[in-house]
């Protein structure tokens, strides 16, 4: 299958103090919340998380094999998967100059593919057929970015707490497709 | 224990004035950013306004803008609307809600307090 | 009429599973974050899911929520008899000056 993954380990995106990629435009006036022009918010702020780990953008690698048909890659990819949540509810103070935290709801963030990178791969096929040489794309780097109407649907897909939470005492597993999805996503090339 | 208690609900005039309050306590009050919501009698939620924790942090329903106005006094652990030119359509429950996370939600919410606008 | 469409009601037997669908369009739900909220007969609304899959502390996890483009959904598995109540979505739109709207309401029925 093409999601053999024999090695998964992970990485959490954590932004900067006081950064926020893609920060929402204020969509009403012009005033400035930015408290640090202002003498800043005491140390205990509202919106501190109460758990770092309730949001976190997250970076599965998983090291598989390519196939397309009977062919399969000579030599194992890495690849990451982009994982888990993103929200202001996370951030720090210095962050509030940039949107509406105090609202009920805002701008939704997903942990979505940011960088891809193209890598060219050897098939080997069976019954003694000559190897053939394909690019690959794969995800390179994953990142919270606003939801817009532009943005692959596929990409977008929520699975829910269950999901972006993998079970305590169970490996992460990447999310489970058809095989011909799959191969047609990696063998998308640049 | 977290409680928000709203009051000065009762009869009015179209056209005429009332103020509801809503007392909190149980939690830090400037922690949370403070909404009124309503419900008018066998209907769904709606939304009236809400506040930060300063007057520049205010927003209001199309339905209300320019009549209402939405106030805070963290010494006092008070939320106010202040309703003018009432119209029969603002007759509703309303209820005070808060929330202490961004994009959060109202987690926090109160019982409620009746407006009837009638003549 | 409100900005987010609901079905005005549904219904399922205990234990069943039972999905409330929420749909908006691209200046509320598709690029804002969906909660849910939970009334009970003559109470106060709850808060039951907030960003769009999060559930506060103390609400069961046989709620669920998701959202996928300008469309939400909350589910409810194990249906009980104390489920009953209206259930709303909300969310933030970004039209005009921007207000939280929410759905009409559904009022989910627990049978026999």
């Known amino acids: 299958q093409g999601w053999q993954a024999f090695k998964n380990d992970a990485t959490e995106i954590i932004p900067e103090l006081g950064e926020y990629p893609e920060p929402p435009p204020e969509l009403e006036n012009n005033k400035t919340m930015n408290r640090a022009e202002n003498g800043g918010r005491p140390p205990h702020h509202p919106f501190e998380t109460k758990d770092v780990s309730e949001y976190s953008c997250r970076e599965l690698h998983f090291t598989r094999y390519v196939t397309d048909g009977q062919c399969r890659s000579a030599k194992p990819v890495t690849e990451l998967v982009c994982s888990g949540q993103c929200g202001p509810a996370r951030l720090l103070p210095n962050a509030i100059g940039r949107g509406k935290w105090w609202r009920p709801s805002g701008p939704d963030f997903r942990c979505i593919p940011d960088r891809y990178r193209a890598q060219r791969v050897q098939l080997l096929c069976p019954g003694g057929a000559a190897p053939r040489a394909r690019k690959v794309r794969l995800v390179a780097s994953c990142k919270c970015k606003r939801l817009t109407r532009f943005h692959n649907q596929s990409e977008l897909k929520d699975f829910g707490p269950e999901a972006a939470r993998p079970q305590k005492g169970r490996k992460p597993r990447p999310r489970a497709r058809g095989a011909k999805a799959n191969q047609a996503e990696l063998e998308n090339a640049y | 224990e977290v409680q928000l208690v709203e009051s000065g609900g009762g009869l009015v005039q179209p056209g005429r004035s009332l103020r509801l309050s809503c007392a909190a306590s149980g939690f830090t009050f400037d922690d949370y950013a403070l909404h009124w919501v309503r419900q008018a009698p066998g209907k769904g939620l709606e939304w009236v306004s809400g506040i930060g924790w300063d007057e520049d942090m205010i927003d209001y329903a199309d339905s209300v803008k320019g009549r209402f106005t939405i106030s805070r006094d963290n010494a006092k652990n008070s939320l106010y609307l202040q309703m003018n030119s009432l119209r029969v359509e603002d007759t509703a429950l309303y209820y005070c809600?808060?929330?202490?996370?961004?994009?959060?939600?109202?987690?926090?919410w109160g019982q409620g307090t009746t407006v009837t606008v009638s003549s | 009429q409100s900005v987010l469409t609901q079905p005005p009601s549904a219904s399922g037997t205990p234990g069943q599973r039972v999905t409330i669908s929420c749909s908006g369009s691209w200046s509320n739900i598709g690029s804002n974050t969906v909660n849910w909220y939970q009334q009970l007969p003559g109470t106060a609304p709850k808060l039951l899911i907030y960003?769009?899959?999060q559930r506060p502390s103390g609400v069961p996890d046989r709620f669920s929520g998701s959202k996928s483009g300008t469309s939400a959904s909350l589910a409810i598995s194990g249906l009980q008899s104390e489920d009953e109540a209206d259930y709303y979505c909300a969310a933030w739109d970004d039209s005009l000056s921007g207000e939280y709207v929410f759905g009409g309401g559904t009022k989910l029925t627990v049978l026999g």
């Open positions: 809600a808060g929330n202490n996370r961004g994009y959060g939600g109202l987690d926090v």
């Open positions: 960003n769009n899959n």
